[in-house]
Amino acid sequence: CDLPQTHSLSNRRTLMIMAQMGRISPFSCLKDRHDFGFPQEEFDGNQFQKAQAISVLHEMIQQTFNLFSTKDSSATWDETLLDKFYTELYQQLNDLEACMMQEVGVEDTPLMNVDSILTVRKYFQRITLYLTEKKYSPCAWEVVRAEIMRSFSLSANLQERLRRKE
């Protein structure tokens, strides 16, 4: 399966939208930095079959969608930007789902690596716990926004490697 060029463009647009979402100066939030333990190894893409890598990317985007779909999120971010954000994430989820369907029967390995999916879910659980502990403060959301932007940048690298694998 070829991830369409539109998927790469959508990923870039997602990052641009997130960059515009900031409401307060991040300089006031330095002391709120937190180690969420981004699962770098799940995005290195070396040990994965293609279908498994796609399922990890899908899980990350799905979890991001869930995180920013909460009422706490809606109360924090600009509604117009959030709607654009949802649209781009939805587009990426559709692309990845279509890709996963094409991979059925192509590879001998399972379509998803359950351990990797769980690792990604636990990563987002840590982010949610942090927001809860910080009472969804503006700075906590700024830190989370920066973290998600970073994880999207790193996942874009995996997508690029997948494209080169064709």
Epitope: P26, K31, H34, E147
Partner: antibody
Framework: EVQLVQSGAEVKKPGESLKISCKGS????????IGWVRQMPGKGLEWMGI????????AYSPSFQGQVTISADKSISTAYLQWSSLKASDTAMYYC??????????????WGQGTLVTVSS | DIQMTQSPSSLSASVGDRVTITCRAS??????LNWYQQKPGKAPKLLIY???SLQSGVPSRFSGSGSGTDFTLTISSLQPEDFATYYC?????????FGQGTKVEIK
Amino acid sequence: EVQLVQSGAEVKKPGESLKISCKGSGYSFTSYWIGWVRQMPGKGLEWMGIIDPSDSDTAYSPSFQGQVTISADKSISTAYLQWSSLKASDTAMYYCARHPGLNWAPDFDYWGQGTLVTVSS
Amino acid sequence: DIQMTQSPSSLSASVGDRVTITCRASQSIDGALNWYQQKPGKAPKLLIYFASSLQSGVPSRFSGSGSGTDFTLTISSLQPEDFATYYCQQSFDFPLTFGQGTKVEIK
């Protein structure tokens, strides 16, 4: 390969203006902040200020607020430090360094080679 | 502003010695402390970040510890290339501040 390349040494007279630069390459320039650090001859390191190149938001040390201006042009991945009226006490080595912003990652992990500014009449 | 105080300001040691440099913050900075090495005419180099994380490419003889207000940089066995000036820096809040430096000289 991540690199921060600074502009060359400058010799200026008191009262003159100056703008030095720091060009980033090998990474996403807007994903990191750029900080500026002063080192006067034979002295220690002093943090001057920082910029987020994605939106040009800045923060300054109180000691340098109003004395210098930090700016950036993300289209050419370059940050700047400028003076409108130099003093002899501005004579120093100036370093730029990248900072991960709010991400949990190493602070000031890459530095420019430094720009020596000499102000003398 | 958060003041950072290093001690000693200079020390003399021999190759193979264990060297310890301390840094004290004027208020709690959790673990938001970095250590840098600087050699004459060169830019500083990051050694340790977040108090105890070893920066990629830095030899394992360097280690950092501490949290709150008191921090330590340890060089387990001093090598000839380690003679330099070392700075601590807090990254807890703006304005970022550095210690005054510790010069490690050859005995």
